[in-house]
């Protein structure tokens, strides 16, 4: 049933009223306001922005708006001792140094407190040695180097190009390979789209542009010093040596002008194939070390960054529900940026601001949502999702009992081609139905629905006439809500054409050139894509908070469970002999999925037919829907990843950004042919199959008739 049936709604105050109140011009104005100075986590400027947002959300009409603070480990460059990398000759003289900061964009030359490019949480150090080029530093790249090419990275400084996987995974892989330092660089092959000018004349990365970013491997822990618990005044803090997820070797990022100087001298082995070659005019030799004439030259890193416990601030706004105030729908996105945050995060924060304003307008006219809506402006997302994780740790007991859904709101755009949605299967039908009601902003789709343009441009690989919806991975603030707490989650933004633009992220990601002008001149001059994203995010929140029956369809979970079971079975079947030898069977898992499918189908029939006017029955059915996601949580967590507790989805162990299905089984099977003890390895596969089977069956039983 539609949200207009909620008892507290007058015909005037429906979804249409909420959507009609959203204005592109306001989003534009908010984005400009949020991007004039840097808002780095832990700085005074970001605290002042938090207070401004608190004040404005109150003006917009929220019931309460509070700042919540935590004292977490952050990382900054040393102001008087800059980080850089040198080429040194045999006498130890520096004959080339990488740049100390990015050339500032026009109009921003006199802005203070622009943090220079650095890899957050890099330890200090001055390693020197020969260079090895490791492509993207993915698991498979190190397999190629070590196993096929017999190149040893031990004691070497590795240079890796950004892209394909989360930078923290690159650093972890380099550490495991024995490297003494890591240089990360942006190759034009990945960050310079052909036919587009570099900033300020276009949206491509100039040669001096550099991607900042953290290099942690937190696996969902939050603040490295207080895993599992909020970093409050009485928190016990680990020592730095026991902190979670910190890298052990120095790391530093550079642009492609500087990378050219390092890579042009490379000698040693040739690159294995074209997939290892970027677009610079260099040979892309792997090394180790420089070629003949330069063989006595070495590379030296100079890293002096410091990690320090610093106060951060979330802004939490509440719009109390009229009927079910103890049921929470959360819309959250971060506020902290690396520099100006033109796209990341302020294109998202501006949308959240306008959504709050629209909800506030309705509330001032006497309306309330059925359920409570919480709005969050998270701090320190760029330093490891810290603000959201600490808040969720502090409020975990409330969230696990009352959390209906979490909608994420980081960058609204990463392109201007079509919609991109990642969410729990429970939200598929909500997203389909909503996008059918929204107008497409795309050229050539005037008067057509967003669903239609999205489906045309990003078709589902499995179902014709439907758009693609991806799995949730991580790398953003939904992580703690979905992967740790099991709260149904989703995210939406406008994206690029992945067919024609194969670069990773958008070229100016986390650089000084991510400005208001980048968005206004090149990505969304009319702010129509921002408005569409506001309608999708806001519309999802409206429906989740206002529908009499929660807009979750458990049958869609049944469909994907079967797909994921098929996929993991096919991976295992690449080892038929071992499966036979060790009696590995997926029969139990397929049986559990079948049971889930049948029970979900019956539940959906009951959901359709039950008496919606009976408040006890209604609450009971809604609770079964709300708690279904929770039922996929294993309290023991995944092996070596205690804060990743969702049995169906986890961030890939090889790329934090990507989602993996049946991750416990997947990781047990990964590279199993190389394990020294195959009996133990296949035993672990069997254990993981049993955990997955139990979890799917247990989740199914939560949908059974209660008595």
């Amino acid at each position: 049933k539609s949200s207009s049936e909620a008892t507290n709604i007058t015909p005037k105050h429906n979804m249409k009223a909420f959507l009609d109140e959203l204005k592109a011009e306001n989003i534009k104005k908010f984005l400009h306001n949020f991007t004039q100075i840097p808002h780095l986590a832990g700085t005074e400027q970001n605290f002042q922005l938090a207070k401004q947002i608190q004040s404005q959300w109150k003006e917009f009409g929220l019931d309460s708006v509070e700042l919540t603070h935590y004292d977490v480990l952050l990382s900054y460059p040393n102001k008087t001792h800059p980080n850089y990398i040198s080429i040194i000759n045999e006498d130890g003289n520096e004959i080339f140094n990488t740049s100390l900061f990015e050339p500032p964009p026009a109009g921003y030359e006199n802005v203070s407190d622009i943090v220079p490019p650095f890899s957050a949480f890099s330890p200090q150090g001055m390693p020197e040695g020969d260079l090895v080029y490791v492509n993207y530093a993915r698991t498979e790249d190190f397999f190629k180097l070590e196993r096929d090419m017999k190149i040893n990275c031990s004691g070497k400084i590795v240079i890796a190009r950004y892209g394909k996987v989360f930078r923290g995974n690159k650093v972890k892989n380099a550490q495991l390979a024995g490297a003494t330092g890591v240089i990360l660089y942006s190759d034009p092959a990945d960050y310079f789209a052909p036919g587009v000018k570099s900033y300020p004349d276009g949206w491509n990365l100039p040669g001096g542009g550099v991607q900042r970013g953290n290099i942690l491997n937190l696996n969902g822990a939050g603040d490295p010093l207080t895993p599992g618990y909020p970093a409050n005044e009485y928190a016990y803090r680990r020592g730095i040596a026991e902190a979670v997820g910190l890298p052990s070797i120095p790391v530093h990022p550079i642009g492609y002008y500087d990378a050219q100087k390092l890579l042009e001298k490379m000698g040693g082995s040739a690159s294995p194939d074209s997939s290892w070659r970027g677009s610079l005019k260099v040979p892309y030799n792997v090394g180790p070390g420089f070629t003949g004439n330069f063989s006595t030259q070495k590379v030296k890193m100079h890293i002096h960054s410091t990690s320090e416990v610093t106060r951060i601030y979330n802004v939490i706004g509440t719009l109390r529900g009229a009927v079910e105030p103890d049921r929470y729908v959360i819309l959250g996105g971060h506020r902290d940026s690396w520099v100006f945050g033109g796209i990341d995060p302020q294109s998202g924060a501006a949308v959240v601001h306008e959504i709050v304003r629209s909800f506030g307008t309705l509330k001032k006219e006497g309306w309330r949502p059925r359920r409570t809506i919480l709005f969050a402006s998270w701090d320190a997302e760029e330093f490891g999702l810290l603000g959201s994780t600490e808040w969720a740790e502090e409020n975990s007991r409330l969230l696990q009992e009352r959390g209906v859904a979490y909608i994420n709101a980081d960058s609204s755009i990463e392109g201007n081609y079509t919609l991109r949605v990642d969410c729990t299967p429970l939200m598929y039908s909500l997203v389909y139905n909503l996008t059918k009601e929204l107008e497409s902003p795309d050229e050539g789709f005037e008067g057509k629905s967003l669903y239609e343009s999205w489906t045309k441009k990003s078709p589902s690989p499995e179902f014709s006439g439907m758009p693609r919806i991806s799995k949730l991975g991580s790398g953003n603030d939904f992580e703690v809500f979905f992967q740790r707490l099991g709260i149904a989650s989703g995210r939406a933004r406008y994206t690029k054409n992945w067919e024609t633009n194969k670069f990773s992220s958008y070229p100016l990601y986390h650089s000084v050139y991510e400005t208001y002008e980048l968005v206004e001149k090149f990505y969304d001059p009319m702010f129509k894509y921002h408005l569409t994203v506001a309608q999708v995010r806001g519309g999802m929140v409206f429906e989740l908070a206002n529908s009499v029956v929660l807009p979750f369809d458990c049958r869609d979970y049944a469909v994907v469970l079967r797909k994921y079971a098929d996929k993991i079975y096919n991976i295992s079947m690449k080892h038929p002999q071992e499966m036979k030898t060790y009696s590995v069977s997926f029969d139990s898992l397929f049986s559990a999925v079948k049971n889930f499918t049948e029970i979900a189908s019956k539940f959906s029939e009951r959901l359709r037919d039950f008496d919606k006017s009976n408040p006890i029955l209604l609450r009971m059915m809604n609770d079964q829907l709300m708690f279904l996601e929770r039922a996929f949580i294993d309290p023991l967590g995944l092996p070596d990843r205690p804060f990743y507790r969702h049995v169906i989805y986890a961030p890939s162990s090889h790329n934090k950004y990507a989602g993996e299905s049946f991750p416990g089984i997947y990781d047990a099977l990964f590279d199993i042919e190389s394990k020294v003890d195959p009996s133990q390895a296949w035993g672990e596969v069997k254990r993981q199959i049993s955990i997955a089977t139990f979890t799917v069956q247990a989740a199914a039983e939560t949908l059974s008739e209660v008595a």
């Epitope: 140094n97 740049s99 100390l100 050339p103 500032p104 570099s198 900033y199 100039p206 040669g207 050219q260």
Partner: nanobody, 126 residues
């Protein structure tokens, strides 16, 4: 209007020192690689030193290496050349020159320069 104004030249004995300054206006120094070049009486223009936009890289002509130091203060929009152990052959008009915008070029000597100042005369004589 883009302007470069050099100062600090003068008469100095061999072995002496001078510090040249170059005040930039009409553009932000922070975005540009910067050069010192010189022209001895009756000779062509000779490149002396270059500094990248951020000061991370400095290159010198072999004839001045170890004696001259180029530096910059981006906050004051000023370029400097510290000249020690001066020799008679260092006598020349010294010009500061603006390199390519670092947003469009790497700021290395082979990028070349576009605008230079009026120059300041340095005379090394006993």
């Amino acid at each position: 209007e883009v302007q470069l104004v050099e100062s600090g030249g003068g008469l100095v004995k061999p072995g002496g020192s001078l510090r040249l300054s170059c005040a930039a206006s009409g553009f932000n120094l922070i975005s540009y690689g910067m050069y010192w070049v010189r022209q001895a009486p009756g000779k062509g223009l000779e490149w002396v030193a270059v500094i990248s936009y951020d000061g991370s890289n400095k290159n010198y002509a072999d004839s001045v290496k170890g004696r001259f130091t180029i530096s910059r203060d981006n906050s004051k929009n000023t370029l400097f050349l510290q000249m020690n152990s001066l020799r008679v052959e260092d006598t020349a008009v010294y010009y500061c020159a603006k390199g390519g915008n670092a947003l469009y070029s790497s700021g290395w000597p082979d990028d070349g320069f576009d605008i230079r100042g009026q120059g300041t005369m340095v005379t090394v004589s006993s």
